[in-house]
């Protein structure tokens, strides 16, 4: 028979999305046991029928990758998990409505920091996502978010920071002291979606000035 409360078997059914990799996760409830099995279905908002996710039927792990199935940026999705205990009790819980554009979080960018004598150059590499374009290429975050920009900060000392920002990929902090260590932080920002990545950090030292030796 079904438990009085589905959360006895199943809790916290939700999408966890990062850079458009969309993973469905859940927890077992207080009455869940290691041999409880889980089956996952998903559907597009507006559709009537649920679709069983191959590879995520009667599994014991507590996650299921739905990146491909929820890969249309303009669609909204639901997923649901059905838990069945060894004793035959079952419970089903559904996610909130999921939009990858809205809900995905941004990982730190991939950046190359290059030391020079009196400057530090930072080159941001476009971040790939699992989403494929019609031509088979993987979309980058820049392809998806028109308003995406990079925010760069260079910690010069305890009281002074230099800032740069823009939609370009190459930046350079000038006027630095040779043979000195600096901490750089670079973040991706998308203001229209209120998104800000965790920072990429690089500790770099300007080159010694050999012209005086």
């Amino acid at each position: 028979h079904a438990p009085e409360d589905p959360s006895d078997l199943l809790q916290h059914v939700k999408f966890q999305s990062s850079n458009f990799e969309n993973i469905l996760t859940w927890d077992s409830g207080p009455e869940g046991t290691p041999d409880t099995v889980y089956s996952i279905e998903y559907k597009t908002y507006g559709e009537r029928d649920w679709v069983a996710k191959k590879g995520c039927q009667r599994i014991t792990r507590k996650s299921c990758n739905l990146t491909v199935e929820t890969g249309n940026l303009t669609e909204l999705y639901y997923a649901r998990v059905t838990a069945v205990s060894a004793g035959g009790r079952s419970a089903t819980k559904m996610t909130d409505r999921f939009s990858s554009l809205q809900h995905t979080t941004l990982k730190p960018p991939d950046v190359t920091c290059i030391s020079k004598v009196r400057s530090i150059q930072m080159i941001v590499h476009p971040t790939p996502t699992p989403i494929r374009a019609g031509d088979g290429h993987r979309l980058t975050l820049e392809d998806i978010f028109h308003d995406l920009f990079y925010h760069l900060e260079l910690q010069v000392n305890r009281t002074y920071q230099m800032h740069l920002g823009g939609k370009q990929r190459e930046y350079e902090f000038f006027g630095l002291t040779p043979d000195t260590e600096f901490l750089g932080t670079i973040m991706i920002c998308v203001p229209t979606w209120a998104k800000e990545s965790a920072p990429y950090m690089c500790r770099v030292k300007t080159l010694p000035d050999r012209t005086w030796t």
Epitope: L73, G165, P191
Partner: antibody, heavy 117, light 107 residues
Framework: EVQLVESGGGLVQPGGSLRLSCAAS????????MYWVRQAPGKGLEFVSV????????HYVESVKGRFTISTDNAKNTLFLQMNSLKSEDTAVYYC??????????WGQGTQVTVSS | DIVMTQSPSSLSASLGDRVTITCQAS??????IDWYQQKPGQAPKLLIY???RLETGVPSRFSGTGSGTSFTLTISGVEAEDLATYYC?????????FGQGTKVELK
């Protein structure tokens, strides 16, 4: 050398349709943000629409939503603007522009669209 | 939408004059303002991006300052070829919006 050449402008009656084209060369068209910008006679500049040629993601200014459609033919490096239900206030020179290395610094020469009975 | 209020709408300058054009954004756009120059019958030409960075090939008499909501374009010594209309553009969020323009004429 980056080149953008618009065509397809002309005189059309209110309620009519027109399709603008912009032939692009000199850069990687299939991985860029492309824009249509217009300028009414004696007036300022207004961004109308934008498309990412790889993802197909589009945005429009509110005044043209539901009437204008931006699209591309990546095989032919061409940007389009399908304009339906045209109004007299759509009369303008229409420019295409592109964002390269973060900057919107390449523009076409423009094509004139006149909506009048 | 972010509204860009540009002033003055026109100004008369003598050659060699220092000219200042201002743009006010209706909300913070950080440093995402670009300045364009447009001459009659031509497409706009990018002069300055990211508030203060000079586009390649643009004379150093053009400069930009500001942050947040208040921005300025300065021409330190107007030359005949600078007589044109100047527009600020916020490149922070869609829809990208221009100021109304400032026409710089000869006194």
């Amino acid at each position: 050398e980056v080149q953008l050449v618009e065509s397809g402008g002309g005189l059309v009656q209110p309620g009519g349709s027109l399709r603008l084209s912009c032939a692009a060369s000199g850069f990687t068209f299939s991985s860029s943000w492309m824009y249509w910008v217009r300028q009414a006679p004696g007036k300022g500049l207004e961004f109308v629409s934008v498309i990412n040629t790889r993802s197909g993601i589009t945005h429009y200014v509110e005044s043209v939503k539901g009437r204008f459609t931006i699209s591309t033919d990546n095989a032919k490096n061409t940007l389009f603007l399908q304009m339906n239900s045209l109004k007299s206030e759509d009369t303008a020179v229409y420019y295409c522009a592109t964002r390269i290395q973060g900057l919107i610094d390449y523009w076409g020469q423009g094509t004139q669209v006149t909506v009048s009975s | 939408d972010i509204v860009m209020t540009q002033s003055p709408s026109s100004l008369s300058a003598s050659l060699g004059d220092r000219v200042t054009i201002t743009c006010q954004a209706s909300q913070s756009i950080r440093s995402f303002i670009d300045w364009y120059q447009q001459k009659p019958g031509q497409a706009p030409k990018l002069l300055i991006y990211g508030t203060s960075r000079l586009e390649t090939g643009v004379p150093s008499r053009f400069s930009g300052t500001g942050s947040g909501t208040s921005f300025t374009l300065t021409i330190s010594g107007v030359e005949a070829e600078d007589l044109a209309t100047y527009y600020c553009l916020q490149d922070y969020s869609w829809p990208l919006t221009f100021g109304q323009g400032t026409k710089v004429e000869l006194k």
